[in-house]
């Protein structure tokens, strides 16, 4: 006999990185017939939704009208069908950005390199932070962490054409409060013809959620996006 229901998916629209004072919607998708959804933040109950009619709804939304550091952190959701509860969703890390200052991103030996060359990014921010984050544009929003008093190094090692793309960095005041993004740095990796033709910018995640983040920073608009649990492995 089943003791729990499958875990729901949780994600943020338009993006899990939210500029301060902008809006974001936390979505939780469970099953049709779920009579109650609960959103939890850092382990505490935050909000409850009882969709009507439950048999026609499998996704609920919780809305944050103006993002701030108190709303940034780890969210999860659960749902109930009858008396049976689901497993909790993966954790959604909701990050507030545009806090305080703007770091500077540079790349060594330069933005145009040959396949096989060793490349290092440097993110510098003079205010009180010791953690830095490097992100490559693309749907995966893969985050690398680096540490240093005012600057962090991000060695990419010998690069391939798969490393091509646009990078930005953030200073982090804590895990969920980040600085303004740096200006972008576009890394161009040239290689032999075979490699170049076979290496799209981000083969795993073609859709651009970074563009969505930028749209949020510039206009604060909401945009409908495909389901994406950024914490899913």
């Amino acid at each position: 006999q089943q003791q729990t229901l499958p875990k729901p998916f949780i994600w943020a629209e338009p993006h899990f990185m939210v500029p301060k004072e902008k809006q974001v919607t936390i979505c939780c998708q469970g099953n049709y017939g779920a009579v109650e959804y609960q959103l939890h933040f850092e382990g505490s109950l935050f909000a409850v939704d009882r969709p009507k009619p439950p048999e026609r709804i499998n996704k609920v939304q919780f809305y944050i009208p103006d993002m701030n550091s108190r709303m940034a952190g780890q969210y999860s959701c659960i749902y109930r069908v009858g008396e049976l509860w689901s497993e909790p969703s993966n954790l959604l890390d909701l990050v507030v950005t545009e806090m305080y200052d703007t770091p500077t991103l540079s790349v060594h030996p330069g933005p145009e390199v040959i396949s096989g060359e060793k490349v290092t990014f440097y993110c510098r921010l003079d205010t009180a932070t010791s953690m830095f984050l490097l992100l490559k544009e693309g749907r995966s929003s893969h985050v690398q962490r680096g540490y240093g008093k005012v600057q962090a190094e991000f060695p990419l090692g010998p690069v391939t054409t798969a490393h091509r793309g646009t990078y930005r960095c953030f200073g982090s005041y804590n895990n969920h409060a980040w600085s303004f993004p740096s200006e972008p740095v576009k890394l161009l990796v040239t290689g032999d013809i075979e490699n170049t033709s076979l290496a799209p910018e981000d083969p795993t995640f073609p859709a651009d959620t970074w563009g969505t983040y930028l749209l949020t920073t510039e206009t604060g608009l909401q945009k409908d996006h495909a389901l994406w649990d950024h914490t899913a492995q």
């Epitope: 809006q23 933040f41 505490s44 109950l45 935050f46 909000a47 409850v48 939704d49 009882r50 969709p51 009507k52 609920v60 939304q61 919780f62 809305y63 944050i64 009208p65 108190r70 709303m71």
Partner: nanobody, 127 residues
Framework: QVQLVESGGGLVQAGGSLRLSCAAS????????MGWFRQAPGKEREFVAG????????YYADSVKGRFTISRDNAKNTVGLQMNSLKPEDTAVYYC????????????????????WGQGTQVTVSS
Amino acid sequence: QVQLVESGGGLVQAGGSLRLSCAASGRTFSSYAMGWFRQAPGKEREFVAGISWSGDSTYYADSVKGRFTISRDNAKNTVGLQMNSLKPEDTAVYYCAAASGQVQTVVVVTDRWYHYWGQGTQVTVSS
């Protein structure tokens, strides 16, 4: 902007009843999720009961479940809290709060998501 004014507090004996009312100004009242919180001396503010903007969904703290009932009248811009079988531990200042932007069936439990607050009304339950 919504302004909230609570009324109905007072002194009551244990086992008695009180009805709190919260009057809201603002034409968009019907689009706000509403809640009642309380704060006893020397304690943190705690959630008591919440209601979605449609009035279809309610949620209660375990400590008041079965004794308190939250309701709303969107035509009159009011939210009520009927409190029965009162206990001395219910003694506190009771606050009404409004949260904007949620869909019609969402009940907000955390005080972080409530944007507007009343000044509070004192409820004292004597033994």
